[in-house]
């Protein structure tokens, strides 16, 4: 089931999903001066079954001025420099789908893609937070957020992360011991069913991953 909101915003922090659950949508957004082709997809969809998942649909952008040319080629390195999408731009590739059944890896870029990726997540998705360059983590508990279903409504748990403006970047994920958490939503649910899936496997996966560089700006 779709989460009807975006993950929480943490000042001076970005978030990243290590893998995307089936049902996740990635909007086909084009950069300024370009638009989706007339018969183009609105979004890519993580689809499949428990043994194999992949992104359905392809995003295609065409110039707003000349609408007869369609582009779908992978950007050249110089084009990628201007992008600040959710892609990990470290040498490390996202976790292979095969290692996390029912999930998709980060989709490849498409030409003239917008500078920021917009995902729509589903219940059970976990995203991980990291302070942006020039900030470091303080008073930190779990630096992640999970979309949960409670009382028939979806909500994201509050990541317990504060980023302070000291010129020192933190490792990610979890290089510090959790300290006193900032005030946030209580995570205990006593009166109704909480639907949470795939948390353990994603947490374990994240814990084994090397430090990754995030470029998403959450707005």
């Amino acid at each position: 089931e779709l989460c009807d909101d975006d993950p929480p915003e943490i000042p001076h922090a970005t978030f990243k999903a290590m893998a995307y659950k089936e049902g996740t949508m990635l909007n086909c957004e084009c950069k300024r001066g370009f638009r989706r082709i007339k018969s183009g997809s609105l979004y890519m969809l993580c689809t499949g079954n428990s043994s194999h998942s992949s992104w359905d649909n392809q995003c295609q952008c065409t110039s707003s001025a000349t609408r007869n040319t369609t582009k779908q080629v992978t950007p050249q390195p110089e084009e990628q420099k201007e992008r600040k999408t959710t892609e990990m731009q470290s040498p490390m590739q996202p976790v292979d789908q095969a290692s996390l059944p029912g999930h998709c890896r980060e989709p490849p870029p498409w030409e003239n893609e917008a500078t920021e990726r917009i995902y729509h997540f589903v219940v059970g998705q976990m995203v991980y937070y990291q302070c942006v360059q020039g900030y470091r983590a303080l008073h930190r508990g779990p630096a992640e957020s999970v979309c949960k279903m409670t009382h028939g409504k979806t909500r994201w748990t509050q990541p317990q992360l504060i980023c302070t403006g000291e010129m020192e970047t933190s490792q990610f994920p979890g290089e510090e011991k959790p300290q006193a958490s900032p005030e946030g939503r209580p995570e205990s649910e006593t009166s109704c069913l909480v639907t949470t899936t795939d948390f353990q496997i994603q947490t374990e996966m994240a814990a084994t991953m090397e430090t990754s560089i995030f470029t998403t700006e959450y707005q």
């Epitope: 779709l2 009807d4 049902g23 949508m25 909007n27 300024r32 001066g33 638009r35 007339k38 018969s39 997809s41 609105l42 979004y43 969809l45 689809t47 359905d56 649909n57 707003s64 917009i118 729509h120 707005q219």
Partner: antibody
Framework: EVQLVESGGGLVKPGGSLKLSCAAS????????MSWVRQTPEKRLEWVAY????????YYPDTVKGRFTISRDNAKNTLYLQMSSLKSEDTAVYYC??????????WGQGTLVTVSA | DIVMTQSQKFMSTSVGDRVSVTCKAS??????VAWYQQKPGQSPKTLIY???YRYSGVPDRFTGSGSRTDFTLTISNVQSEDLAEYFC?????????FGGGTKLEIK
């Protein structure tokens, strides 16, 4: 909570003009694509117009192209639909809708436009 | 334009029953189909996206299926609050088009 409140509907003569507004709240309006959809008296649903978050790209079906113009003021969190050369077949309840993956994920309560002599 | 046909304008069912609303596209639309529920006096509410995925807050008794040209919305264990009109919609290509609607009546 997402709220979309349409206004500006009313009775107009054939050939006349009308401008609808949709006040949005509860979400980052300036980063969301928006649409207008109408529902005829026979309850048929018809997509009318679509605008990208920045307002630079717009889309219309042929039935309204050249007569209707969708626009937005992101500073005011407001979506507009300027309708001209109105016909009796434009009589409908007009809904604004926000995109959330789907083009029409969340709908307002609608405003009635009646085109009649 | 792609025509979305909901051949049954009315369907009658009882509380606890299972009912299937069908929709046929005039050409291949992949799985780019949504289903909406409109209760009397209200605006439409999204139930299903991409033919088979439940939207936010939608009870799991609503299930979507199908691809290409044939699509089905199934309501299992029908409740009295499911009294509504159900519309399919394709967003595979412009202009985006809706089915004519199927009104569900509860006996």
């Amino acid at each position: 909570e997402v709220q979309l409140v349409e206004s500006g509907g009313g009775l107009v003569k054939p050939g006349g003009s009308l401008k609808l507004s949709c006040a949005a709240s509860g979400f980052a309006f300036s980063s969301i694509d928006m649409s207008w959809v109408r529902q005829t008296p026979e309850k048929r649903l018809e997509w009318v117009a679509y605008i990208s978050s920045g307002g630079d790209n717009t889309y219309y079906p042929d039935t309204v192209k050249g007569r209707f113009t969708i626009s937005r003021d992101n500073a005011k969190n407001t979506l507009y639909l300027q309708m001209s050369s109105l016909k009796s077949e434009d009589t409908a309840v007009y809904y604004c809708a926000r995109r959330y993956g789907l083009p029409f994920a969340y709908w307002g309560q609608g405003t009635l436009v009646t085109v009649s002599a | 334009d792609i025509v979305m046909t909901q051949s049954q304008k009315f369907m009658s069912t009882s509380v606890g029953d299972r009912v299937s609303v069908t929709c046929k596209a005039s050409q291949n639309v992949g799985t780019n189909v949504a289903w909406y529920q409109q209760k009397p006096g209200q605006s439409p509410k999204t139930l299903i996206y991409s033919a088979s995925y439940r939207y936010s807050g939608v009870p799991d008794r609503f299930t979507g299926s199908g691809s290409r040209t044939d699509f089905t919305l199934t309501i299992s264990n029908v409740q009295s609050e499911d009294l509504a009109e159900y519309f399919c919609q394709q967003y595979n290509s412009y202009p985006w088009t809706f089915g004519g609607g199927t009104k569900l009546e509860i006996k």
